[in-house]
């Protein structure tokens, strides 16, 4: 009985398949380039299994290598708008603790209205990820156009 | 002996690592914006381990959180072509059962000829995913330019 | 005791969670379109757990289905630069052994300065992946702008 229970628990507890997919809640006040995220089944298809939100920023709860992915679409945007407002840039990084602050992933919109990318990176318990959108265009809040997530891959 | 067998089966059967990578088969008739997919080793590097194809659309066989990814490249395309034919949009969503119909991921081509993105989303057994390409440009059928896949991540 | 040990080893040894994330080292000499990669904790946040580097190219050590992902950003680039130097193309493929040579993933920059994509593909022990950048623009060596990685997903 205990063996079967250990088998069942293995993937989620022992392996620690922490995962989160977030949707945009709101942008920050004028001098704050951060995007503020939200997640949970009541909101639609977003969720947090392991990681937590701390004032709209994603905090990691388990050490490991993670796949981080993001898509951001600019609101009411055309290629003309995007090029006129260049540079509009999205950066994902560890923003706290300050000792581990680093940019993990960075993209510019140039003449496009959507950026999407992903990468593998080591993250530690307590790391908080921030997503900074610099520029004068608003991100779309549509849940199929703007989203941000992480997936634990291995220790 | 039985224990060793259980160990071997754990990742694929108990954990249910369903996965599929598809290549474009054809586009739909005029009023049907859906892309029709195909997969299997006889076709090259595409495959289905768990999910199935139902009339060219991908049907999920196991509940869980999935990483869905897609890349679509437009055929005989330049930035001029793409901007001239704007809006050309790609949307991935659950199209059946109707009660669960929702758009999961959406991108426009603007002045580019390729879109690529990925996201985590909960899917249930029986969900069918459709990929809708709206616009007047054809997607490339080259297997390294247009592909669509899912990967089971956790329950 | 031995059972507990087997449990601990299961994810990394039995399941073989090979994973690598690389940063750009340098471009090749003039007639060589390949990008040369580097990885390891001394270099920052890049790493190799399983796969190895062979003269800057990634060599697979375990059979399986892999998620391959890449982002490449062009150096000192604007949409004008990118369109002027079209076609600038990035292709990821198996380059050795020659009998398995194939293009896995291909994107053009058109009017953008960054490409990013990912796909699932079967890879075999000994497969070497090459990333070919054709065109007259340099790839950025910033670690948050240009990176390449693989993640073992299942046998």
């Amino acid at each position: 009985q205990r063996f079967a229970q250990a088998q069942q628990q293995l993937p989620l507890e022992s392996l620690g398949w922490d995962v989160a997919e977030l949707q945009l809640n709101h942008t920050g006040p004028q001098q704050d380039p951060r995007l503020y995220w939200q997640g949970g089944p009541a909101l639609g298809r977003s969720f947090l299994h392991g990681p937590e939100l701390d004032k709209g920023q994603l905090r990691i709860h388990r050490d490991g290598i993670y796949m981080v992915h993001i898509q951001v679409t600019l609101a009411i945007c055309s290629s003309t708008t995007a090029s006129r407002h260049h540079p509009t840039t999205l950066a994902v990084g560890i923003c706290s603790p300050a000792s581990r602050s680093i940019s993990l992933l960075r993209l510019s919109f140039h003449q496009g209205c959507t950026i999407a990318s992903q990468r593998l990176t080591p993250l530690a318990r307590g790391d908080t990820l921030c997503t900074n959108l610099t520029g004068t265009l608003l991100p779309s809040r549509n849940t199929d156009e703007t989203f941000f997530g992480v997936q634990w891959v291995r220790p | 002996q039985r224990f060793a067998q259980a160990q071997q089966q754990l990742p694929l059967e108990s954990l249910g690592w369903d996965v599929a990578e598809l290549q474009l088969n054809h586009t739909g008739p005029q009023q049907d914006p859906r892309l029709y997919w195909q997969g299997g080793p006889a076709l090259g590097r595409s495959f289905l381990h768990g999910p199935e194809l139902d009339k060219g659309q991908l049907r999920i066989h196991r509940d869980g959180i999935y990483m869905v990814h897609i890349q679509v490249t437009l055929a005989i395309c330049s930035s001029t072509t793409a901007s001239r034919h704007h809006p050309t949009t790609l949307a991935v969503g659950i199209c059946s059962p109707a009660s669960r119909s929702i758009s999961l991921l959406r991108l426009s081509f603007h002045q580019g000829c390729t879109i690529a993105s990925q996201r985590l989303t909960p899917l249930a057994r029986g969900d069918t995913l459709c990929t809708n390409l709206t616009g007047t440009l054809l997607p490339s059928r080259n297997t390294d330019e247009t592909f669509f896949g899912v990967q089971w991540v956790r329950p | 005791q031995r059972f507990a040990q087997a449990q601990q080893q299961l994810p990394l040894e039995s399941l073989g969670w090979d994973v690598a994330e690389l940063q750009l080292n340098h471009t090749g000499p003039q007639q060589d379109p390949r990008l040369y990669w580097q990885g390891g904790p001394a270099l920052g946040r890049s790493f190799l757990h399983g796969p190895e580097l062979d003269k800057g190219q990634l060599r697979i050590h375990r059979d399986g289905i892999y998620m391959v992902h890449i982002q490449v950003t062009l150096a000192i680039c604007s949409s004008t630069t990118a369109s002027r130097h079209h076609p600038t193309t990035l292709a990821v493929g198996i380059c050795s052994p020659a009998s398995r040579s194939i293009s896995l993933l291909r994107l053009s920059f058109h009017q953008g300065c960054t490409i990013a994509s990912q796909r699932l593909t079967p890879l075999a022990r000994g497969d070497t992946l090459c990333t070919n950048l054709t065109g007259t623009l340099l790839p950025s060596r910033n670690t948050d702008e240009t990176f390449f990685g693989v993640q073992w997903v299942r046998p």
Epitope: - | - | Q30, A75, I76, R84, T136, S140
Partner: antibody
């Protein structure tokens, strides 16, 4: 091997214009910016401007205040630099130059130079 | 415009000795993980010849006694063992942005 061959020396009056040509061979003319750099006698090097022959787009050094015009003829793989409203301080050797592989503004290949003398 | 300042203006070095020329940019010429700084050699009556590109890359066919180093705003061209044929004027140049600009030149002679 890329070769850039320039037109011969010119003597011009102040206020007139000069047009120097640069014929490229041995490479893909339309894929690389062609730059023009000048060097006054006993002085250093000064970048004047560039053209991307593929689409005719130009970039100019603002120091020349609209006096320089760079053009290209893809059919003959030739670039041209015209400098107007000449004055004595425009007396210099004028070079065309381009990169060998990466299309950034460092210069692997140079023409032999064209001496333009402005004198009344 | 980025101003490039070379030092010294002239330099006399014995044959077989090391020669070092410095170049300072008025702002950083580094971007995207590269330093967009290049070095040229010019002999009388000839066009300049590219020696070093992107701060530390030796151009094909250039003897390996020439080397470049530096990042950001401060760069150095070094000739490890001066030969008679190295007598020339040396220029640094940036290509970080338009317009690219050159240093004023350093005249290298044999002592």
């Amino acid at each position: 091997e890329v070769q850039l061959v320039q037109s011969g020396a010119e003597v011009k009056k102040p206020g007139s214009s000069v047009k120097v040509s640069c014929k490229a061979s041995g490479g893909t003319f339309s894929r690389y910016n062609m730059h023009w750099v000048r060097q006054a006698p006993g002085q250093g090097l000064e970048w004047m401007g560039a053209i991307f022959p593929g689409n005719g787009e130009t970039s100019y050094n603002q120091n020349f205040k609209g006096r320089v015009t760079i053009t290209a003829d893809k059919s003959t793989s030739t670039a041209y630099m015209e400098l107007s409203s000449l004055r004595s301080e425009d007396t210099a050797v004028y070079y065309c130059a381009r990169n060998s592989y990466y299309d950034y503004a460092w210069f692997t290949y140079w023409g032999q130079g064209t001496l333009v003398t402005v004198s009344s | 415009d980025i101003v490039m300042t070379q030092s010294p203006d002239s330099l006399a070095v014995s044959l077989g000795e090391r020669a070092t020329i410095n170049c300072r940019a008025s702002k950083s010429v580094s971007s995207s993980g590269y330093s967009f700084m290049h070095w040229y050699q010019q002999k009388p009556g000839q066009p300049p010849k590219l020696l070093i590109y992107l701060a530390d890359n030796l151009e094909s066919g250039v003897p390996d006694r020439f080397s470049g180093s530096g990042s950001g705003t401060d760069f150095t061209l070094t000739i490890s063992s001066l030969q008679a044929e190295d007598v020339a004027v040396y220029y640094c140049q940036h290509s970080r942005e338009f317009p690219p600009t050159f240093g004023q030149g350093t005249k290298l002679e044999i002592k």
